[in-house]
């Protein structure tokens, strides 16, 4: 079997079970004239052997623990013992096995915990070692806690971390812990190698003391610090403490702010380092740190909040240096002229923010002072004496006086006179007549241009035209611009249009006055425009309703079984015929009509989960517009594949006679899911027959073993049958053969006499 | 025990061949390599090369590659070195040797068979 | 090739005295096996060469303890302790670490 296990001299690499008695030659190296020998150096450790043949083997179970890896050189020789071909490296890969349980390295811990300390934060560490590999299951540790006493409501306060050993708080026990309640805890910790996947894994256990210490590391009370304060600064305002000395304090600006005023000192005492403005900013909350020397927080930061107070430090202002309100001719007394609203940047709904308004001056005086008034706490300016004219005085100053308890400020009005409002807005036309666009027309486009004209007084209230549409178009689509000096709208697209939706939009514009009309005057039909908006269709691709489409199913569904379905609906209402794209197994078919997904074939697992094919949804009719979706289907493992040897084990061998009863270990696998806990194999032999001269033990949930009962054996091949059950449900069961040859050795090597090499078994027991 | 018996010493012409024998008893014949050294009374002690019995194989150290032939005969367990187109620095005496198999040295050395090349 | 040198053409010595003789190589013969692949023996006057030691240290089956063999991988030494009259002769020393196999050129044992 060239190749496999001969072949020429050459850079190898071989993997052997660790604990395993040697049941395999590992190689035979083949020699070029003038090479008649070998020669085996390096790591041999008395274990690895050549012969002179070429036969490398090894004599005794290996320990990986020992050694994981033996470097080997082998040399071919001539006559002489001159090497005439390498030496090459051969790298025996010594597989690890679980033959080592994980230990504590103590039997007992102790520690102690504060209480609120930050849940997750370690502050001890049980370790274990384990001597396997801990690349593999059998050298990673699982940690866990077994019991907690005592167990308060049935809620664990401590957890520890599976693979490191860290135990720390959780949050309950971060909230909860007091050490006035109970000051002491007792942990049984539990390791388990084979990541504590299995239920052949070794373990250990060891007991944890834990005491409770008082945490002072608190927030303090929200601070209240009054601002503008004059005192000498820094002031120290609060403080927080660590448990224990030597902690590093800092504050922590979440809020980012240019200046942030306070500070810590090493005491953990906390200053305002400026005064405060509260029209700045009212409100501080920030956090206070406690690091060890290494710059590691110790815990949770502190929130520090600081309430700025207010004093009455800013006077009322303006809201602009003159405001200006229109009245009407003739309008009657107690109408609402405007509202002057000032400003006062102290807080709200205060002393210190509350204003009074009073009339101060009025000119001119005409016909007489007093023509207007103000109310005190509102600002609202009404007419108080009697209706204006506007040849007799077209304009008005008033100066008010605003204040709050401390200061006072003067604001001025400007009141002008305007015409009355007798003239209605008139539409140079009453019908814009039928406009057609495409619905993918830009947003912001200009569609229309309106005219209203208005004969009041120009620029006032009274002809100013604002244009509203008010019927036709209730999802807001369009909006109409007015240019004040003109008075032309501009009537823009403000929401893309739909075809669908709204194919003809009857449209009505209202134009109208900012100033209201006059008694007895009211809006007619000249204030009222229509056009007609005509939408056509642009072809729009069919619309999956999701991105992607999952299903879930077993992978023994029955051929014919819905798997899922997809849906699209096409803007334009066409209808829609749907069609599966990328099915490479040939395991599905959709229904064109309604996107139902059947299966057309046994669906298989094993072969790949989740199974991706793209949907696709066309146009029926129309320019056949098509859209891709995917559909995913999650396969659910079923127990289909019995149990299979994991390797070739061809060439098994005894050497005869045997001397003792001999044995060989054999794994076994399987393809379908194993979560958790790996395959759960049971053993056993194939026939009954067999039970004179063999016997199957389990070793783990993979591995057995295979002894002879005796030693009384042919020189010949037997085949031994050995069945192998997987306990799923269903169970499901192989019988597999192990073909094992009792032949005559030499130098612990099946011998055949020369001419006779084919078939030389290549495992030796 | 293991002995090398060779042939008697050789007058010969300069320009002529000669034949020695390393006759072999004690031990099986192609077992081991069976090596050929010249020494001569100013020069010291040469490495001429070997053969393998077993499968006939020589090798010849550069400097003797025209001038020497080996071969063995298994069926009288007789080693044969030729030495041709002799000159007067071929006078010497030869050696024939055993090197004994895995563990690598000259454990049995011949006789010697001196050479004269002389006309 | 490997050069060896005896630098030592002859060495006197009174019997029941210790002499060394030495040997170098221009290669070192150690082999990554762990061996050395000098070699050691003594040509009497009118006889065939006869093996003292091999493979650096050790002593060949029948060689009297006397001999021994010692060094490093290119500096070498045979000593014999007590010489007597029949260890007079020429002691040469051979490397047989590759082809072609050489030769020291031999150091003659003299009594005193």
């Known amino acids: 079997q060239e190749g496999k296990f001969s072949g020429p001299l050459k850079p190898m690499t071989f993997s052997i079970y660790e604990g395993q008695e040697p049941s395999q030659i590992i190689f035979q190296f083949k020699a070029n004239p003038p090479a008649v020998t070998f020669e085996l150096t390096g790591e041999t450790d008395n274990i690895f052997v050549i012969e002179r043949e070429g036969l490398l083997y090894y004599n005794r179970a290996l320990d990986r623990e020992t050694r994981s890896t033996h470097n080997l050189q082998v040399a071919a020789l001539d006559a002489n013992g001159i090497i005439v071909e390498g030496p090459v490296p051969i790298t025996i890969k010594v597989k690890d096995i679980n033959d080592n349980r994980p230990t504590f390295l103590q039997s007992k811990y102790e520690g102690s915990v504060r209480q609120n300390s930050r849940p997750g934060k370690p502050f001890l560490y049980v370790n274990a070692t384990d001597l396997d590999d801990p690349a593999t299951p059998n050298g990673q540790l699982y940690y866990q806690i077994v019991i907690q006493l005592p167990m308060i409501n049935n809620v664990m306060y401590f957890q520890i971390n599976n693979k490191t050993g860290a135990i720390s708080l959780t949050r309950e026990g971060s909230q909860e812990l007091n050490p006035a309640k109970n000051p002491s805890y007792n942990l049984v910790i539990s390791v388990k190698d084979m990541g504590g996947q299995s239920e052949n894994s070794f373990s250990d256990t060891t007991s944890v003391d834990i005491i409770v210490t008082e945490n002072i590391w608190k927030a303090p009370k929200p601070v209240e610090m009054v601002e503008n304060s004059t005192d000498p600064h820094p002031i120290k305002i609060t403080q927080v403490r660590w448990n224990d000395p030597g902690a590093q304090y800092s504050l922590v600006d979440k809020e980012k702010l240019p200046r942030f005023p306070f500070s810590i000192d090493q005491e953990g005492d906390i200053y305002v380092t400026q005064p405060l403005d509260r029209e700045e900013k009212d409100a501080y909350v920030f956090y206070a740190v406690a690091k060890d020397e290494y710059g590691k927080p110790l815990s949770y930061p502190l929130e520090i909040h600081v309430k700025v107070k207010d004093i009455n430090d800013n006077p009322p202002t303006c809201p602009s240096p003159v405001t200006v309100f229109e009245v009407q001719e003739n309008e009657r007394l107690g109408n609402s002229i405007g509202t002057l609203t000032a400003h006062d940047r102290d807080e709200e709904n205060t002393a210190n923010s509350f204003l009074n308004y009073r009339i101060v001056e009025q000119t001119p005086k005409l016909p007489m002072d007093g023509l207007f008034l103000i109310q005190t706490y509102a600002g609202m300016l009404q007419l108080a004496k009697q209706s204006l004219k506007k040849q007799d005085t077209p304009q008005y100053n008033l100066t008010i006086e605003v204040s709050d308890k401390d200061f006072k400020t003067l604001c001025f009005v400007q009141i002008n006179v305007i015409d009355i409002n007798d003239q209605i807005p008139i539409f140079e036309k009453s019908d814009y007549g039928n406009l057609t666009l495409a619905e993918d027309t830009n947003i912001g486009s200009t569609i229309l241009t309106i005219q209203a004209t208005d004969a009041d007084e120009p620029f006032t209230g009274s002809s100013k035209i604002l244009y509203h549409i008010i019927k036709g178009d209730s999802e807001g689509r369009l909006g109409v611009d007015t240019d004040p000096h003109t008075n032309t709208g501009y009537v823009i697209i403000k929401k893309p249009l739909d075809f669908e939706t709204a194919a003809v939009s009857n449209i009505v514009f209202k134009a109208e006055n900012p100033e209201p009309l006059v008694f007895g005057v009211k809006y007619n039909a000249s204030s009222f425009a229509k056009f007609t908006l005509i939408v056509t269709d642009v072809n729009e691709a069919p619309q999956f309703s999701q991105h992607v489409f999952q299903a879930k199913v077993s992978e023994d569904v029955a051929i014919g079984t819905k798997v899922g379905n997809v849906t699209a609906k096409d803007p334009e209402g066409l209808d829609i015929s749907y069609s599966l794209r990328g099915d490479t197994r040939g395991w599905l078919k959709i229904d064109h009509v309604t996107g139902e997904i059947f299966s057309v074939a046994p669906l298989d697992r094993e072969a790949g989960s989740p199974y991706r094919v793209q949907v696709v949804a066309t146009e029926v009719g129309g320019s056949s517009l098509s859209s891709v979706s995917e559909f995913h289907l999650i396969l659910m493992d079923v127990n289909d594949n019995p149990p299979r040897l994991a390797k070739d084990y061809t060439g098994l061998f005894f050497c005869h006679p045997l001397s003792a009863p001999g044995s060989l270990i054999f794994e076994a696998t399987d393809d379908d899911q194993h979560l958790f806990r790996g395959p759960h194999f049971t053993f056993s032999l194939g026939s009954g027959s067999l039970q004179n001269d063999w016997e199957v033990s389990k070793i783990n949930g993979t591995h057995a073993r295979l002894s002879t009962r005796h030693t009384e054996f042919e020189e010949r091949e037997y085949v031994v049958l050995i069945r192998i059950n997987d306990g799923g449900r269903p169970p499901l069961e192989g019988i597999v053969s192990l073909p094992v040859t009792f032949c005559s050795c030499v130098e612990g090597s099946c011998f055949r006499p020369a001419g006779h090499q084919t078939g030389i078994p290549t495992v030796g027991m | 025990q293991v002995q090398l018996q060779q042939s008697d010493a050789e007058l010969v012409k300069p320009g002529a061949s000669v034949k020695i024998s390393c006759k072999v008893s004690?031990?099986?014949?192609?077992?081991?390599?069976i090596h050929w050294m010249k020494q001569r009374p100013e020069q010291g002690l040469e490495w001429i090369g070997y053969?393998?019995?077993?499968?006939?194989?020589?090798k010849y150290n550069e400097k003797f590659k025209d001038k020497a032939t080996l071969t063995a005969d298994k069926s009288s367990s007789t080693a044969y070195i030729q030495l041709n187109t002799l000159t007067s620095e071929d006078s010497a005496v030869y050696f024939c040797a055993r090197f004994y198999y895995g563990y690598w040295y000259f454990d049995v050395w011949g006789t010697g068979t001196t050479v004269t090349v002389s006309s | 090739d490997i050069v060896m040198t005896q630098a030592a053409p002859s060495v006197p010595v009174t019997p029941g005295e210790s002499v060394s003789i030495s040997c170098r190589s221009s290669k070192s013969l150690l082999r990554s096996n762990g061996n050395t692949y000098l070699y050691w023996f003594l040509q009497r006057p009118g006889q065939s060469p006869q093996v003292l030691i091999y493979?650096?240290?050790n002593l060949a089956s029948g060689v009297p303890d006397r001999f021994s063999g010692s060094g490093s991988g290119t500096a070498f030494t045979l000593r014999i302790s007590r010489v007597e009259a029949e260890d007079v002769g020429v002691y040469y020393c051979?490397?047989?670490?590759?082809?072609?196999?050489?030769f020291g050129a031999g150091t003659k044992l003299e009594l005193k």
């Open positions: 004690g031990y099986t014949f192609t077992d081991h390599t």
């Open positions: 051979m490397q047989h670490l590759e082809y072609p196999f050489t």
């Open positions: 053969i393998y019995p077993r499968d006939g194989y020589t």
């Open positions: 493979r650096m240290s």
